[in-house]
């Protein structure tokens, strides 16, 4: 039942999680943990925020969005196969057992082997296409080669990301971005 996200070895993985603060600066503590959300708190915490700031993080895990506006999406830098698994985003809403909990499944795939350069690729390299991908970390701008290369790598990755981002669709379609207060 977890929402699934994908990345390749060596890329940055992006796991979305959002809430809407009741007022600007009126933040809610959030924790990210490796493993499904337990009943209370987060297990194996990799990053935590409090009412003011990120107060705990481990290497390679960071928040690239504006967490002060409720974007607490997790970026995992330079992923390896060992990063595969379920991650818990827990929005610690004040109250008794009132937290919002999201289990997100990260699937890491081996890096694609880039084929040897061809004459066509040499030609198009003089006119590189630019594609900015949001889904793999901090607005990485990647220079891409020929159209076949785009289709095989970036577009398929983006298509997978769009297809797999059921959480984002749910949030959009049902108005389920969490509003505090």
């Amino acid at each position: 039942s977890e929402v699934e996200y994908r990345a390749e070895v060596g890329q940055n993985a992006y796991l979305p999680c959002f809430y809407t603060p009741a007022a600007p600066g009126n933040l809610v503590p959030v924790c990210w943990g490796k493993g499904a959300c337990p009943v209370f708190e987060c297990g194996n915490v990799v990053l935590r925020t409090d009412e003011r700031d990120v107060n705990y993080w481990t290497s390679r895990y960071w928040l690239n969005g504006d967490f002060r506006k409720g974007d607490v999406s997790l970026t995992i830098e330079n992923v390896t196969l060992a990063d595969s698994g379920i991650y818990c985003c827990r929005i610690q809403i004040p109250g008794i057992m009132n937290d919002e909990k999201f289990n997100l499944k990260l699937v890491i795939k081996p890096a694609k082997v880039t084929p040897a350069p061809t004459r066509q690729r040499d030609f198009t390299a003089a006119f590189p296409r630019m594609l900015t991908t949001r889904g793999h970390g901090p607005a990485e701008t990647q220079t891409l080669g020929s159209l076949p290369d785009i289709n095989l790598t970036q577009i398929s990755t983006l298509a997978n990301e769009l297809r797999d981002s059921r959480l984002a669709n749910d949030l959009r379609d049902s108005g389920a971005t969490i509003r505090i207060g």
């Epitope: 039942s1 499904a36 959300c37 009943v39 057992m97 937290d99 919002e100 909990k101 999201f102 969490i178």
Partner: antibody, heavy 113, light 107 residues
Framework: QVQLQESGPGLVKPSETLSLTCTAS????????INWVRQPPGKGLEWIGW????????KYNPSLKSRATLSTDKSKNQASLNLDSVSAADTAIYFC??????WGKGSTVTVSS | DIQMTQSPSSLSASVGDRVTITCKAS??????LGWFQQKPGKAPKTLIY???RLVDGVPSRFSGSGSGQDYTFTISSLQPEDIATYYC?????????FGPGTKVDIK
């Protein structure tokens, strides 16, 4: 706004199964805990169990001796409680709650032949 | 299971009085204690969580304190609308357990 509504038969015969449904709205159903609590007439509150609709995890009050089963239907934003082999002692108002902060109005169930 | 004892079981006080209810857990519950107000025919309403944190919108005359096994709920100045039964709840571990309740009325 967050709303929960319990529904089910008001009268159940002894030894039968009590079935209640809790319909939730106003929030992301799969991301929040649901608790069930009951209150016999003129008595205090008793916790029945907990379910997390996101993955179906459950916890139960051992005092119910495995008679309770909690489940969810995510497509309908509904949580369900089944209580087997009921007796007069199960007569109560049954509440569902999101976490324990937002409660339904309660559903009165009488066990009688 | 963690047992919760609550006292008194009932009390009568005058409008404006300070009212105190205590709740004791059979073991340390790490401040995972809530207080609820229930009026006849209504669902319980959360007033306090984590022992001393007031739920948004709840009047400031309600307060909670305590740690470990011993907790206190206070109404600093009793109002007519505060007539209700008050319950404590431990949510440190399953099964969750409520205190038996304290019925508060006006003299």
């Amino acid at each position: 706004q967050v709303q929960l509504q319990e529904s089910g038969p008001g009268l159940v015969k002894p030894s039968e199964t009590l079935s209640l449904t809790c319909t939730a709205s106003g929030y992301t159903f799969t991301s929040s805990d649901i608790n069930w609590v009951r209150q016999p007439p003129g008595k205090g509150l008793e916790w029945i169990g907990w379910i997390f609709p996101g993955d179906g995890s459950t916890k139960y009050n051992p005092s119910l001796k495995s008679r309770a089963t909690l489940s969810t239907d995510k497509s309908k934003n509904q949580a369900s409680l089944n209580l087997d082999s009921v007796s007069a002692a199960d007569t109560a108002i049954y509440f569902c709650a999101r976490g324990l902060d937002y409660w339904g109005k309660g559903s009165t169930v009488t066990v009688s032949s | 299971d963690i047992q919760m004892t609550q006292s008194p079981s009932s009390l009568s006080a005058s409008v404006g009085d300070r009212v105190t209810i205590t709740c004791k857990a059979s073991q340390d519950i790490n401040s995972y204690l809530g207080w609820f107000q229930q009026k006849p025919g209504k669902a319980p309403k959360t007033l306090i969580y984590r022992a001393d944190r007031l739920v948004d919108g709840v009047p400031s005359r309600f307060s909670g304190s305590g740690s470990g096994q011993d907790y206190t709920f206070t109404i600093s100045s009793l109002q007519p609308e505060d007539i209700a039964t008050y319950y404590c709840l431990q949510y440190d571990e399953f099964p969750l357990t409520f205190g038996p309740g304290t019925k508060v009325d006006i003299k």
